[in-house]
Amino acid sequence: QAGPLPKPTLWAEPGSVISWGNSVTIWCQGTLEAREYRLDKEESPAPWDRQNPLEPKNKARFSIPSMTEDYAGRYRCYYRSPVGWSQPSDPLELVMTGAYSKPTLSALPSPLVTSGKSVTLLCQSRSPMDTFLLIKERAAHPLLHLRSEHGAQQHQAEFPMSPVTSVHGGTYRCFSSHGFSHYLLSHPSDPLELIVSGSLEDPRPSPTRSVSTAAGPEDQPLMPTGSVPHSGLRRHWE
């Protein structure tokens, strides 16, 4: 008796983070013995799609001509050979940006910071959100990922950095998201350039606790002008 069929490889081109309205192609690569490929989407009736293999039969293409909210989510693929169905691929998380208006990103007290001092990056959203992502350009993964502990909707999240070193310098953007689908992100904020001056060196950034603040009511400032002393957001390293 032969062992289980090897799991296929699943990936997306041009990538797994796609702006609303853009096209994306999902590829599933199995073996030359594959007769059929199946793509499943989490929380959708299975199979989400089926495709015949492309020659030389070791992969199949699943096309999304225009990215919308419906396509965002977690996918796995399988292939069928004469001896049966393969193991599922590792999951592919397809994320859509542009689901909400862009947040605004600020550096407090200033984007010009001396090495060894503290700076806080503040990401503020127009509508209440429960997840905020801080991205550094040319970094492989989100630098920080703040999520509300109790589903509390917040208008902002603070990303404190202390002590600041030259490692912190660079261009940052932030995104916001709702808990009901972390596969749907806002447009990215405008970029923020953090400039670190001075020569104090520290090998690793060490963000401290995060703080979130709810927006004021109507006829008050549209964004908060102070901050609540406790955190409603939980920090995750990614």
């Epitope: 609303w20 309205g21 919308t68 909210e69 859509m96 542009g98 689901a99 909400y100 208006s101 862009k102 947040p103 605004t104 600020s106 407090l108 007290p109 503040l122 503020q124 127009r126 509508s127 902002q156 749907l184 806002s186 603040t213 109507e218 006829d219 008050q220 400032p221 549209l222 964004m223 908060p224 002008t225 102070g226 901050s227």
Partner: antibody, heavy 117, light 113 residues
């Protein structure tokens, strides 16, 4: 390409109501607030209120509260503004506009409403 | 309500010259939470809707020519067109988004001298 396309011009009698539509395309409709702004002939801009298509949340300028009603049809990506008890000073161009962060990055072409007996 | 007052009401400037429009708010638009000024500038040409030029008092909207710039903080703001072009003839509005209701200045009509 983001587009907000509004319904055509209307002529109404005093005391009547008018319902103006604004059909959105080219972006994720549910996640962006849509506001309405009034511009009387030869005059400036006045904010009426907003609706958030995701959950139907609305907020109105006190000046228009009780007369302006905003609704949304998510199936057609369309928002509506109904203005009741029309009077001559309601003669204006009405714009829908997409909110970016309380400011407006895209505007509809405008709908002229004329109130005349 | 925050009252926005623009000056002058109208302005005539020669092609290639600098145009300056001022906007004053009845209270500060500078937020202590993020050190940003909640002010936008729009351009409106005859028969067209307004077009966003500047937000956060000084951030130029994508696609807006760099001859347009915004400055100021607190209650006093300025829109500057560094070298006036024929296509810049329009009415310009400032808008505060610090508090509800959102309010606009009365507009400044810019013409060519």
């Amino acid at each position: 390409e983001v587009q907000l396309v509004q319904s055509g011009a209307e002529v109404k009698k005093p005391g009547a109501s008018v319902k103006v539509s604004c059909k959105a395309s080219g972006y994720s409709f549910s996640g962006f607030y849509i506001d309405w702004v009034k511009q009387p002939p030869g005059k400036g801009l006045e904010w009426i209120g907003y609706i958030f298509p995701s959950n139907g949340e609305t907020s109105y300028n006190q000046k228009f509260k009780g007369r302006a009603t905003m609704t949304v049809d998510k199936s057609t990506s369309t928002v509506y503004m109904e203005l009741s008890s029309l009077r001559s000073e309601d003669t204006a161009v009405y714009y829908c506009a997409r909110q970016a962060f309380y400011y407006f990055d895209y505007w509809g072409q405008g709908t002229t409403v004329t109130v005349s007996s | 309500d925050i009252v926005m007052t623009q000056s002058p009401d109208s302005l005539a400037v020669s092609l290639g010259e600098r145009a300056t429009i001022n906007c004053k708010s009845s209270q500060s638009l500078l937020s202590s939470s993020n050190q940003k000024n909640y002010l936008a500038w729009y351009q409106q040409k005859p028969g067209q809707p307004p077009k966003l030029l500047i937000y956060w008092a000084s951030t130029r909207e994508s696609g807006v020519p760099d001859r347009f710039s915004g400055s100021g903080s607190g209650t006093d703001f300025t829109l500057t067109i560094s070298s006036l072009q024929a296509e810049d003839v329009a009415v310009y509005y400032c808008q505060q988004y610090y508090s509800y209701p959102l309010t606009f200045g009365q507009g400044t009509k810019l013409e060519i001298k």
